[in-house]
């Protein structure tokens, strides 16, 4: 039985140019995690493998870094990163958890009151 | 002045699919996203999912994915919403509902879609 | 998902009278970076709902200054200062932190 929960950062605003975090962690379960892929709508960004360490698909080299631990970094933020972003955390013996955040980028001079953030 | 035109009523047969437009009027359509709501018995308040215009992406409830899918038309700036496989479960009124930028709230709504499923 | 609990399931009210709506979630709306993302909407029958609040605190444009919203973490509130004829109908809170967003299963503002 699949015991185990995931907590995503939540949803997030950002502005175009800046750098944002994605973090999911899975609790709740003593399963192992064996890999964690990311993926936005159905193209793999990146994958964590517990044996192998990190891969960063090539399309997306230039803008995506690994970590915070089991995380991902997007940089230089574009309108078109808008979207959902799939944490799926492959486990032994649960099986597969997924968690999703949906990341919205404004531009700049999008003047909706500021929920928006830019990591240095 | 922002305005989502939905279109009208449906009688419609159990295991019947069918499409509900939201014409989109006095903002930029691909500046923002498109919701959609679903409202049972009056009351109860269902987020179905969203489109994003300017890269055609989309966000599901879990709940509805296999029952919803949502497309757009940017030329004629016009959200389309197909329900699939009716049953009386999917009898409901549905809203479409223009993103607030920023704030993954809902700031203009349509006047909603009354859909009935029934032999 | 996040399940958002609205108390109460009616509100009896009469006009001049000053109320509370309370929204409270299974878990925290706020985001890692301590942004929280919930808003209010006023449903009156045979019209479109209408945004009152969003953002916790932030009145949309053209909603009277008698409604305002607080809160943080899992208990948010929205307050009528002063209920008018106008504001009668179904209130709904609305989380999006988290997907899916989830609403909150209404108060009933009627008159006594």
């Known amino acids: 039985m699949m015991t185990g929960t995931i907590e995503t950062t939540g949803n997030i605003s950002a502005e175009k140019g800046g750098s944002i975090i994605l973090q999911c962690h899975l609790s709740s379960t003593t399963a192992q995690v064996t890999q964690v892929n990311w993926e936005q709508q159905d193209q793999l960004l990146a994958i964590c493998n517990a044996d192998l360490g990190w891969h960063i698909s090539p399309s997306f080299k230039d803008r995506v870094a690994p970590g915070p631990g089991l995380g991902l970094t997007l940089q230089s933020l574009t309108v078109n990163d808008t979207g959902e972003y799939f944490c799926i955390y492959h486990t032994y013996p649960d099986g597969t958890y997924t968690g999703r955040i949906f990341l919205e980028v404004l531009e700049s001079s999008v003047a909706e009151h500021g929920a928006r953030f830019q990591i240095p | 002045e922002v305005q989502l035109q939905q279109s009208g009523p449906e009688l419609v047969k159990p295991g019947a699919s069918m499409k509900i437009s939201c014409k989109a009027s006095?903002?930029?359509?691909?500046?923002?996203?498109m919701n959609w709501v679903k409202q049972s018995h009056g009351k109860n308040l269902e987020w179905i999912g969203l489109?994003?215009?300017?890269?055609?992406?989309?966000s599901y409830n879990q709940k509805f994915k296999g029952k919803a899918t949502l497309t757009l038309d940017k030329s004629s700036s016009t959200a389309y919403m197909e329900l699939l496989s009716l049953t009386s479960e999917d009898s409901a009124v549905y809203f479409c509902?223009?993103?607030?930028?920023?704030?993954?709230?809902?700031?203009?709504w349509g006047r909603g879609t009354s859909v009935t499923v029934s032999s | 998902d996040v399940v958002v609990t609205q108390t109460p399931l009616s509100l009896p009210v009469s006009f001049g009278d000053q109320v509370s709506i309370s929204c409270r979630s299974s878990?925290?709306?706020?985001?890692?970076?301590?942004?929280?993302?919930l808003s209010w909407y006023l449903h009156k029958p045979g019209q479109s709902p209408q945004l009152l609040i969003y953002?916790?605190?932030n009145r949309f444009s053209g909603v009277p200054d008698r409604f305002s919203g607080s809160g943080s973490g899992t208990d948010f509130t929205l307050k009528i200062s002063t209920i008018k004829p106008e504001d009668l109908g179904m209130y709904y809170c609305?989380?999006?932190?988290?997907?899916?967003?989830?609403f909150g299963g209404g108060t009933k503002l009627e008159i006594k």
């Open positions: 509902a223009r993103g607030l930028r920023g704030y993954f709230a809902m700031d203009y």
């Open positions: 006095g903002y930029s359509f691909t500046d923002y996203t």
């Open positions: 489109i994003i215009p300017y890269n055609g992406g989309t």
């Open positions: 878990q925290s709306l706020a985001n890692s970076y301590g942004v929280t993302y």
């Open positions: 953002g916790i605190s």
């Open positions: 609305l989380q999006g932190t988290h997907q899916p967003w989830t």
